[in-house]
């Protein structure tokens, strides 16, 4: 049995994935739970098994089709339900009418690489993954660089207000190890949020030439 409040949050990656997190304050005994997606105007429906991510929250990914297929539009409404097994039947624990393009969170950027590195500068590029063609080039990015002795939270955010899949980091210290991350967000959607941060890219600036004033 379940008591307490629950929170059920889902995001659409703009192509063929809806990721959901269900949080439940009360005690949940060993039971099987799943998310069920039922679109109002599509012939398919989809289910995923909720797996624990912490003591009181569970997550799963609804895979709607091939990663780059456009499975939903702005007029789709998907009824999302959390169902938990109670004996021989399923009990509805949470429900929402989900508007995919009001609840966007893109996949984290991928394929980060150092294009060119110098003593004080580093040019880095990346790619976006599974972003809808509807956005065309209209995306924004945030980037951050981890310097020695600092935390990610202390790193200043660099904002790129257009679909620019590269950055030139300046005023770096020679012969120093850095890490870099980037995230992406579309312009559309009342509840749209930033993608997760990319996997960090580690790089090292070149040492200053001997005998030269730096």
């Amino acid at each position: 049995a379940v008591n307490g409040t629950s929170q059920f949050t889902c995001f659409y990656n703009s192509r063929a994935n809806i990721s959901c997190v269900w949080s439940q304050d009360g005690a949940l005994q060993d039971t099987s739970c799943q998310v069920h997606a039922w679109p109002d105007r599509r012939r398919w429906n989809q289910t995923c098994e909720l797996l624990p991510v912490s003591q009181a929250s569970w997550a799963c990914n609804l895979i709607l089709g091939a990663p780059d297929s456009q499975k939903l539009t702005t007029v789709d409404i998907v009824t999302l339900r959390v169902l938990c097994r109670e004996g021989v039947r399923w009990r509805v624990m949470a429900i929402q009418d989900f508007k995919p393009f009001e609840n966007l969170r893109l996949m984290a950027p991928i394929s980060l690489q150092v294009v060119h590195v110098e003593t004080h500068r580093c040019n880095i590029s990346w790619e976006i993954s599974q972003a809808s063609h509807y956005f065309e080039r209209h995306l924004e990015f945030e980037a951050r660089t981890l310097s020695p002795g600092h935390t990610w939270e202390e790193a200043p955010l660099l904002t790129l207000k257009q679909k620019q899949e590269w950055i030139c980091l300046e005023t770096l210290t020679p012969d120093t190890q850095y890490e870099f991350q980037v995230r992406v967000k579309p312009l559309q959607g009342e509840f749209t949020t930033w993608s997760p941060w990319s996997q960090p890219l580690a790089f090292r600036t070149k040492p200053a030439a001997l005998g030269k004033d730096t």
Partner: nanobody
Framework: QVQLVESGGGLVQTGGSLRLSCAVS????????MGWYRQVPGKQRELVAD???????KYADSVKGRFSILRDSVKNTVYLQMSSLKPEDTGIYYC?????????????WGQGTQVTVSS
């Protein structure tokens, strides 16, 4: 500037047929849904039929089996084939297009075309 141009309305007898068409033109856009709504005096505009990307069509219960919607994504045109028309199908038929422009989605409407079904 986006423009929706409707055509094909007119006066027809009960049991007759009409074909409406609506073409979208103008600035750079991507359409993800196009459809038809109708309005009768004293009532709100209501969905007749629409078609979203992926070929997903939606029809009002009152027109199922009589009307069919066809969308040509290359020409950015939507058609409504209306058959077995009834007097209660009379109204102003409006075309609606959901368009992505510069990364944001908005709905655009045509001026409307009158359909009158006489008994």
């Amino acid at each position: 500037q986006v423009q929706l141009v409707e055509s094909g309305g007119g006066l027809v007898q009960t049991g007759g047929s009409l074909r409406l068409s609506c073409a979208v033109s103008g600035s750079r856009f991507i359409s993800d849904v196009m459809g038809w709504y109708r309005q009768v005096p004293g009532k709100q505009r209501e969905l007749v039929a629409d078609m979203a990307d992926g070929g997903s069509a939606k029809y009002a219960d009152s027109v199922k089996g009589r009307f069919s919607i066809l969308r040509d994504s290359v020409k950015n045109t939507v058609y409504l084939q209306m058959s077995s028309l009834k007097p209660e199908d009379t109204g102003i038929y409006y075309c609606k297009a959901g368009l992505w422009i510069a990364g944001r989605h908005s709905d655009y409407w045509g001026q409307g075309t009158q359909v009158t079904v006489s008994s």
